[in-house]
């Protein structure tokens, strides 16, 4: 009985559609599949950024696959054909691997690329990215930012740059419709008459870099002779209440009494009748229910209560 063999897929390639890191891996069926017309052929695809320890592995019946990559590094991929055991009256048969690579030919030395790239999605509404020019680049160097996320037809260039000494050092983005909970790709490239400039690629998800506004309307309410309830309201804007964590800092008579993290808009504080002054500030951050990470807001304005009459029901300033 002859050994069953199958060829690897043909024309395996990585295609860059210009989406700044979102690439297409595509291939054609292997030659000589005539013997297996009744069979559903599958493909095992492995791919990774060069330098990564682990391969991502996909088994698919399709002739294409799409995923995001870090274009600062090269990409390697390999694929082989799988004949399920049902097709071969025995064990699964695999072809040899077809392999391909892709990288963007780097221009310029690494030091010329932007430094300290920092992006913040303010209040889940306004994205702002800033950077420092590369090391040793001249003032004639200018950087340009391009971005793409699924839903855009093509990569877009920043139209509102932040400038210093005539150089672009940041970008204020326009309203980004349906842009969260998906990968957001950025490329910052540059040009200079003096020397070539290295491009930089970045990928993140917007909900993970949100910096909310601080909480507002801080108030005190006397609950009992030894308890005061601190209350505040969620920051103004589109972020739902369930998405916030809060950190409170409370000072009693100029001594830091409590720093606490809470998940709702109240905190009950034990006090004594000797308390002369009570001040607190609060800040907010998007929590784990709504994102994988977040950035603390600025602290709220300080709210203080001063005086001897602790019997007042509500203490507002």
């Amino acid at each position: 009985d002859t050994e069953i063999k199958v060829n690897p897929p043909q024309d395996f390639e990585i295609v860059d559609p210009g989406y700044l890191g979102y690439l297409y891996l595509q291939w054609q069926p292997p030659l000589s599949l005539d013997h297996f017309k009744e069979c559903t052929v599958e493909y095992e695809l492995k791919y990774r950024n060069i330098g990564s320890e682990t391969w991502k592995t996909i088994i698919t019946k399709n002739l294409h696959y799409k995923d995001g990559f870090d274009l600062n590094k090269g990409i390697e991929a390999k694929i082989h054909t799988l004949l399920p055991w049902q097709c071969t009256n025995g064990s699964e048969v695999q072809s040899s691997w077809a392999e391909t690579t892709y990288w963007i030919s780097p221009q310029g030395i690494p030091e010329t690329k932007v430094q300290d790239m920092d992006c913040v999605y303010y209040n889940w509404q306004y994205l702002l990215c800033s950077w420092k020019p590369g090391i040793g680049v001249l003032l004639d160097t200018n950087y340009n930012l391009f971005y793409w996320y699924e839903g855009l037809d093509h990569a877009l260039q920043c139209v509102d740059y932040i400038k210093a000494d005539g150089q672009n050092i940041g970008c204020r983005f326009p309203y980004l419709e349906a842009s969260d909970y998906k990968d957001f790709y950025i490329c910052v490239n540059g040009s200079s008459e003096n020397k070539p400039i290295r491009s930089s690629y970045f990928t993140f998800q917007l909900q993970n870099i949100v910096k909310p506004l601080p909480p507002v309307y801080l108030t005190f309410t006397r609950e009992s002779s030894c308890e005061i309830k601190l209350k505040w309201s969620i920051p103004l804007g589109p972020i739902p209440a369930r998405c916030f964590d809060y950190e409170i800092e409370i000072r009693e008579d100029d001594t830091t009494l409590v720093t606490a993290t809470v998940e709702n808009e109240t905190y009950t504080l034990k006090t004594t009748n000797e308390t002369r002054q009570l001040c607190f500030v609060v800040r907010s951050k998007v929590n784990i229910y709504c994102s994988d990470d977040g950035i603390w807001s600025e602290w709220s304005d300080k709210q203080c209560w001063e005086g001897e009459d602790l019997s007042k029901k509500t203490l507002l300033r």
Partner: antibody
Framework: EVQLLESGGGLVQPGGSLRLSCAAS????????MSWVRQAPGKGLEWVSA????????YYADSVKGRFTISRDNSKNTLYLQMNSLRAEDTAVYYC??????????????WGQGTLVTVSS | DIQMTQSPSSLSASVGDRVTITCRAS??????LNWYQQKPGKAPKLLIY???SLQSGVPSRFSGSGSGTDFTLTISSLQPEDFATYYC????????FGQGTKLEIK
Amino acid sequence: EVQLLESGGGLVQPGGSLRLSCAASGFTFSSYAMSWVRQAPGKGLEWVSAISGSGGSTYYADSVKGRFTISRDNSKNTLYLQMNSLRAEDTAVYYCARYGHYAYGSYFDYWGQGTLVTVSS
Amino acid sequence: DIQMTQSPSSLSASVGDRVTITCRASQSISSYLNWYQQKPGKAPKLLIYAASSLQSGVPSRFSGSGSGTDFTLTISSLQPEDFATYYCQQDYYLFTFGQGTKLEIK
């Protein structure tokens, strides 16, 4: 592919301590919040603790607050659970799980195979 | 804390049957509800998130519905590999699971 591999389980006496580890691979570990979920023998699932991608925010079930500490080392792609003052009711298989997020919500999209912690004298 | 109650606790059915499992929350959780399948000795597997969204790679015979406090998981035509324990889980506040529904072969 995404892989989560727990280790560190075993037999410990009541009042003792144990440190669980979860080695992650196949994804950008620092970009994801992570969690520990446990399952007592023959029982249902119970969420234990969670940590944000950077490690800056941590969350605990009331049943373990003050006794367990969750942490992560993003340079080692590893999640930890330090368990102190262990009780018989902490006996369970402990799973490491990765968070996925959708519009203002979350779920556990990948789970490890679990590690068994037995608290008994 | 939010309690999640599943019914029934166990259920016997045959291959090809249509099966419905219900989950009730002790307070409104909007659509912040997920469903998992667990087989003996294995880790849970996500089936449905946000009450009705099918997780990638999960067969379309699984569907979810509901919002507020009452939710259902439906398997339109049971397959042999579907016999397992199913859990609902809310992520509205903290992360609590239902007690599980064991689906057995009749």
